[in-house]
Interface confidence: medium
């Protein structure tokens, strides 16, 4: 297994609708044709998988239908969007990239993007 550098932004603030987007960029030493991208969430020393997609270079990422993630790829960059986030989802979101085929297999793990989610204040009742 060979190591690969993965870069991602340090901090991202989710929108008021609970949507956060960030770019995950990897330094590909070879020309991979099949790439797997996994988003991991680290909170309180617990790491859980948020979503994952395997895609062909030049093609769109395809996440499972019920996934909270969507994404597009362009060269060695993956634009990831996570939706449906609540304040309790605030945490470190780590991008893991695997160059699956052809060999050699490369694995890269980013330092993580701290996503801050602030639940919107409920609108006050208005009397008419």
């Amino acid at each position: 297994c060979k190591a690969m550098h993965v870069a991602q932004p340090a901090v991202v603030l989710a929108s008021s609708r609970g949507i956060a987007s960030f770019v995950c960029e990897y330094a590909s030493p070879g020309k991979a044709t099949e790439v797997r991208v996994t988003v991991l969430r680290q909170a309180d020393s617990q790491v859980t998988e948020v979503c994952a997609a395997t895609y062909m270079m030049g093609n769109e990422l395809t996440f499972l239908d019920d996934s909270i993630c969507t994404g597009t790829s362009s060269g060695n960059q993956v634009n990831l969007t996570i939706q449906g986030l609540r304040a309790m989802d605030t945490g470190l979101y780590i991008c893991k990239v695997e160059l699956m085929y052809p060999p050699p297999y490369y694995l890269g793990i980013g330092n993580g993007t701290q996503i801050y989610v602030i639940d919107p204040e409920p609108c006050p009742d208005s009397d008419f």
Partner: antibody, heavy 119, light 110 residues
Framework: QVQLVESGGGLIQPGGSLRLSCAAS????????MNWVRQAPGKGLEWVSV???????YYADSVKGRFTISRDNSKNTLYLQMNSLRTEDTAVYYC?????????????WGQGTLVTVSS | QSVVTQPPSVSGAPGQRVTISCTGS?????????VHWYQQLPGTAPKLLIY???NRPSGVPDRFSGSKSGTSASLAITGLQAEDEADYYC??????????FGGGTKLTVL
């Protein structure tokens, strides 16, 4: 124990069709990169086709449009559907498993099945 | 005609060292893809000898070694033995999303 067993070869007339099977045991065909490689009598190895873990398929120019690679995950079997066969398709056909998710390169071959295209 | 070229034959006396070259292009070997080497005895399936340019699977003697530089790779066999007489193939990958094999080299032990 990993095992790949090809079957379905035989004598077929030009223009005919044949389906080769490669029954796998000891691993899952859906979790590996599965190839068909052929070797004409007295000649070298020639790559035919591959099916990726994600299901994408690719073919050598010499068989494109005539051959179709597929897999049945429930039967853990790889297939090669060969149509419009030509005399130059005569060869021993091997299935080859390669790749590895942990970075350890995996490479296993079947014993091969002979396809003879002749009138 | 293979896009990856090997010499059709090489020979050497027992105990000698022989090398087999595998020359490709910038779209395969030179693109950063791994090269593998196989040994094939008559009537048998190919056996992996070297993977990832220079790694030996368990059970393969250290007399066999591989290297890669630029658009070519090579297999070296030291201390040649009679049982090394076989056909040898290199395998690479191509940016056209295909697997490519060299044309094969017949090794004769004199």
């Amino acid at each position: 124990q990993v095992q790949l067993v090809e079957s379905g070869g035989g004598l077929i007339q030009p223009g005919g069709s044949l389906r080769l099977s490669c029954a796998a045991s000891g691993f899952s065909v859906s979790n590996n990169y599965m190839n068909w490689v052929r070797q004409a009598p007295g000649k070298g190895l020639e790559w035919v086709s591959v099916i990726y873990r994600g299901g994408s398929t690719y073919y050598a120019d010499s068989v494109k449009g005539r051959f179709t690679i597929s897999r049945d995950n429930s039967k853990n079997t790889l297939y090669l559907q060969m149509n419009s066969l030509r005399t130059e398709d005569t060869a021993v056909y091997y299935c080859l498993r390669e790749g590895g998710t942990s970075g350890d390169y995996v490479n296993d071959w079947g014993q091969g099945t002979l396809v003879t295209v002749s009138s | 005609q293979s896009v990856v070229t090997q010499p059709p034959s090489v020979s050497g006396a027992p105990g000698q060292r022989v090398t087999i070259s595998c020359t490709g292009s910038s779209s395969n070997i030179g693109a950063g893809y791994d090269v593998h080497w196989y040994q094939q005895l008559p009537g048998t399936a190919p056996k992996l000898l070297i993977y990832g340019n220079k790694n030996r699977p368990s059970g393969v003697p250290d007399r066999f070694s591989g290297s890669k530089s630029g658009t070519s790779a090579s297999l070296a066999i030291t201390g040649l033995q009679a049982e090394d007489e076989a056909d040898y193939y290199c395998q690479a990958y191509d940016s056209s999303l295909s697997v490519v094999f060299g044309g094969g080299t017949k090794l004769t032990v004199l």
